[in-house]
Interface confidence: low
């Protein structure tokens, strides 16, 4: 799996999970989240050569097409596969609210 | 939806479905498929600005992050959403076989 266990231990130019810390205030302009101040969102990036963690048959077709036609505009892309939620604390007036924001943390990637 | 009905009628630089015809022999080097000779595989391409057909909350976070930090390498990507199968005819010896290859045709796209 193209997850932290593999990607953070290896120098990998191909599609892999990349570390990314997001500060809500600085990076997103969000001032409404009280806790946490930021989180490890991570992201997916890297090349998608033929058969590298291909998501679907179409991805395989597209990467093979791209191998034979390297200048073509059609090529697969490295995107998130497994995501996890993030629990946040915010206030409505003086009332604290705890909420789970779904699909906030990328755990693994794929070529799609 | 970022499908043919919308994308093929509009000139759209943002993430959208793009037409792509693949000739099995010429483009993929596949000689084993007897019929069809090729098919409209389509593909997804284009920019993913903030809130443009975002797949998940992480995609929204990433595109907003990318808007505020345009030099960052972390940005969403335009990928396939809905896919359809393709029915093919091939031979094993002199015996014709009809098979459905799943996820071969892209019908719509999303930013992920």
């Amino acid at each position: 799996a193209l997850d932290a266990a593999y990607c953070f231990r290896n120098v990998q130019d191909n599609c892999c999970l990349r570390p990314l810390y997001i500060d809500f205030k600085r990076d997103l302009g969000w001032k409404w989240i009280h806790e946490p101040k930021g989180y490890n969102a991570n992201f997916c990036a890297g090349a998608c050569p033929y058969l590298w963690s291909s998501d679907t048959q179409h991805t395989k077709v597209l990467s093979l097409y791209n191998t034979i036609n390297p200048e073509a505009s059609a090529s697969p892309c490295c995107v998130s596969q497994d995501l996890e939620p993030l629990t946040i604390l915010y206030y409505i007036g003086n009332t604290p609210k705890i909420e789970q924001l779904s699909n906030m943390i990328v755990k693994s990637c794929k070529c799609s | 939806a970022l499908d043919a009905a919308y994308c093929f009628r509009n000139v759209q630089d943002n993430c959208c479905l793009r037409p792509l015809y693949i000739d099995f022999k010429r483009d993929l080097g596949w000689k084993w498929i007897h019929e069809p000779k090729g098919y409209n595989a389509n593909f997804c391409a284009g920019a993913c600005p903030y809130l443009w057909s975002s797949d998940t909350q992480h995609t929204k976070v990433l595109s907003l992050y990318n808007t505020i930090n345009p030099e960052a390498s972390a940005s969403p990507c335009c990928v396939s959403q809905d896919l359809e199968p393709l029915t093919i005819l091939y031979y094993i010896g002199n015996t014709p076989k009809i098979e459905q290859l799943s996820n071969m045709i892209v019908k719509s796209c999303k930013c992920s």
């Epitope: 200048e71 505009s73 | 093929f8 000139v11 793009r18 037409p19 015809y21 391409a45 920019a47």
Partner: antibody, heavy 122, light 112 residues
Framework: QSLEESGGRLVTPGTPLTLTCTVS????????VNWVRQAPGKGLEWIGY?????SAYYASWANGRFTISKTSATVDLKITSPTTEDTATYFC???????????????????WGPGTLVTVSS | AAVLTQTPSPVSAAVGGTVSISCQSS????????LSWFQQKPGQPPKLLIY???TLTSGVPSRFKGSGSGTQFTLTISDVQCDDAATYYC????????????FGGGTEVVVK
């Protein structure tokens, strides 16, 4: 990957003329092709393009004077009513692919055809 | 429609010397970097040298350098060779108008 123009000849003013750009080594469903012209001793002038999706765009001065269309392996440029000012060498040029998106051409036209000469004279 | 104005022609350069050609656009090019430089010799089609304002096309000597952003761009040729004698054109890409592309008037480089 190559492009080659054909159809250039001597025509009288007002006689419609169609130039053809024949491509090989790449698919027109994945690439945008431009038409550019150059009058004798003058500079390059962008006429318009047809996108991989089949949409044609024209320079404002060229709108109505030219029509761009395509088949699976050719791109046509029709000069609807040529005048002497249309005397030029006409080139077709493909958008070079930059990165993963067809839109990211960065004004890069490559490769080009050798050109075809159109002379409009009475 | 955008107008691209180039350095008046001709420009003289000595073998081994350096020559700079400027290109000014009446409006910002798309993404501030949709600008290319072409070299053309008599009887030949233009040859792409630089795209994206500063990216050298494969096979083009590193003596050619593109710089600039937005509306002001420069092509610099260092260690000028006899083979560099040609006419150089800039081309800009634009969004939001029917005039998607425009060429500069050209600058002839004479090598002494």
């Amino acid at each position: 990957q190559s492009l080659e123009e054909s159809g250039g000849r001597l025509v009288t003013p007002g006689t419609p003329l169609t130039l053809t750009c024949t491509v090989s080594g790449f698919s027109l469903s994945s690439y945008t092709v431009n038409w550019v012209r150059q009058a004798p001793g003058k500079g390059l002038e962008w006429i318009g393009y047809i996108s991989y999706g089949g949409s044609a765009y024209y320079a404002s001065w060229a709108n109505g004077r030219f029509t761009i269309s395509k088949t699976s392996a050719t791109v046509d440029l029709k000069i609807t009513s040529p005048t002497t000012e249309d005397t030029a060498t006409y080139f077709c040029a493909r958008h070079m692919q930059v990165g993963g998106a067809p839109t990211g051409s960065m004004a890069a036209f490559d490769p080009w055809g050798p050109g075809t000469l159109v002379t409009v004279s009475s | 429609a955008a107008v691209l104005t180039q350095t008046p022609s001709p420009v003289s350069a000595a073998v081994g010397g350096t020559v700079s050609i400027s290109c000014q656009s009446s409006q910002s090019v798309y993404n501030n970097n949709y600008l290319s430089w072409f070299q053309q010799k008599p009887g030949q089609p233009p040859k792409l040298l630089i795209y994206g304002a500063s990216t050298l096309t494969s096979g083009v000597p590193s003596r050619f350098k593109g710089s600039g952003s937005g509306t002001q761009f420069t092509l610099t040729i260092s260690d000028v060779q006899c083979d560099d004698a040609a006419t150089y054109y800039c081309a800009g890409g634009y969004s939001g108008s029917s005039d998607k592309y425009a060429f500069g008037g050209g600058t002839e480089v004479v090598v002494k």
